[in-house]
Interface confidence: medium
């Protein structure tokens, strides 16, 4: 898998899209996970609704949301109030039993808010470190939550 780079600005929302073959992955739940190391595990951040037919419902874990357009074949992840430590390598996954197929590898890059006059030295961001040949950059700054959309409280 090539890796797609999504760039967002700290404090704003970032939408990550993962297209897939809707027929091939029919009936499968999806997940968003964070790669912890080169050969380490991909730690689950959030997954779609337990009932596949309700995958269109947005599910939250902290500031991260996931929703799945199962007909159109697009998994969408929203990182709300993007923070420097949200940067890193992630995967969109299609789940079947105890197995998971990688739909897309995603590198999230967090840029300092140019309008934020706090000292950037007080911010910390993590980084990216695997060899990603032909990485594709998508500047994807998404809108904020719609009024009435209430995320689950953050998890520790």
């Amino acid at each position: 898998h090539n890796t797609t780079v999504f760039q967002g600005v700290a404090g704003q929302s970032l939408q990550v899209s993962c297209p897939y073959d809707s027929m091939k992955h029919w009936g499968r739940r999806k997940a968003w996970c964070r790669q912890l190391g080169e050969k380490g595990p991909c730690q689950r951040v959030v997954s779609t609704h337990n009932l596949w037919l309700l995958s269109f419902l947005r599910r939250w874990n902290g500031s991260t949301a996931i929703t799945d357009d199962t007909l159109g074949g697009t998994l969408t992840i929203t990182l709300r109030n993007l923070q420097p430590h949200d940067a890193g390598l992630y995967q969109c996954q299609s789940l079947h039993g105890s197995e998971a197929d990688t739909l897309r590898k995603v590198l999230v890059e967090v840029l300092a808010d140019p309008l934020d006059h706090r000292d950037a030295g007080d911010l910390w961001f993590p980084g990216e470190s695997e060899s990603f040949e032909d990485a594709h950059v998508e500047h994807s700054i998404s809108r904020s939550l719609l009024e009435g959309e209430i995320p689950f409280p953050p998890t520790s």
Partner: antibody
Framework: EVQLLESGGGLVQPGGSLRLSCAAS????????MAWVRQAPGKGLEWVSS????????YYADSVKGRFTISRDNSKNTLYLQMNSLRAEDTAVYYC????????????WGQGTLVTVSS | DIQMTQSPSSLSASVGDRVTITCKAS??????LAWYQQKPGKAPKLLIY???NRFTGVPSRFSGSGSGTDFTLTISSLQPEDFATYYC?????????FGQGTKLEIK
């Protein structure tokens, strides 16, 4: 094989300037966040500065803020650290390092270059 | 800022010994901890990330454990090449903080 090779260290007087370079090979440099970490003689490790893989954002430790500038040239696979207004307490071995995705730990380091600030 | 305190600062042991180095955080850092090994005149090398995951090529005699504020690096059976200085590091969240180091010497 990942290789990071620092250069540019040396003896400089207080108030002087120095530019460190780090030549990277063995990986796709433009896809990596990079950092400088230093170690004063006989002391522990201290993070100095970092920047995103595109170079779009830079970050500095309080101790060097306003004096040091980190940059990169992805076409040359090279990381830089411009050090101005140097002080005696900046004397250290400076390591170029890359970090694993989104985690803040450094998986590969250069061999280091010694910067000595003394009159 | 969160402080990382290692103990002991120095330690003498023999080849074959089981050695434990501890790292204490001044606040809860979850499992966000890494360990490095550094030999004199050399760059640090990553050993363990996220408390217990061994980095590529690190021998199985090295293991990490702990969570919250108390962490441990264990070397199950010391080898001659293990005599070095070991550092813990808080990772993932700011600021990046290293412990002061533990020097492991031959008894």
């Amino acid at each position: 094989e990942v290789q990071l090779l620092e250069s540019g260290g040396g003896l400089v007087q207080p108030g002087g300037s120095l530019r460190l370079s780090c030549a990277a090979s063995g990986f796709t440099f433009s896809n990596y966040y990079m950092a400088w970490v230093r170690q004063a003689p006989g002391k522990g490790l201290e993070w100095v500065s970092s920047l995103t893989n595109s170079g779009g954002s830079t970050y500095y430790a309080d101790s060097v803020k306003g004096r040091f500038t980190i940059s990169r040239d992805n076409s040359k696979n090279t990381l830089y650290l411009q050090m101005n207004s140097l002080r005696a307490e900046d004397t250290a071995v400076y390591y170029c390092a890359k970090e694993w995705a989104g985690s803040g730990y450094f998986d590969y380091w250069g061999q280091g270059t010694l910067v000595t600030v003394s009159s | 800022d969160i402080q990382m305190t290692q103990s002991p600062s120095s330690l003498s042991a023999s080849v074959g010994d089981r050695v434990t180095i501890t790292c204490k955080a001044s606040q809860n850092v979850g499992n966000n901890l890494a360990w490095y090994q550094q030999k004199p005149g050399k760059a640090p090398k990553l050993l363990i990330y996220y408390t217990s995951n061994r980095f590529t090529g690190v021998p199985s005699r090295f293991s990490g454990s702990g969570s919250g504020t108390d962490f441990t690096l264990t070397i199950s059976s010391l080898q001659p090449e293990d005599f070095a200085t070991y550092y813990c590091q808080r990772i993932y969240n700011s600021p990046w903080t290293f412990g002061q180091g533990t020097k492991l010497e031959i008894k």
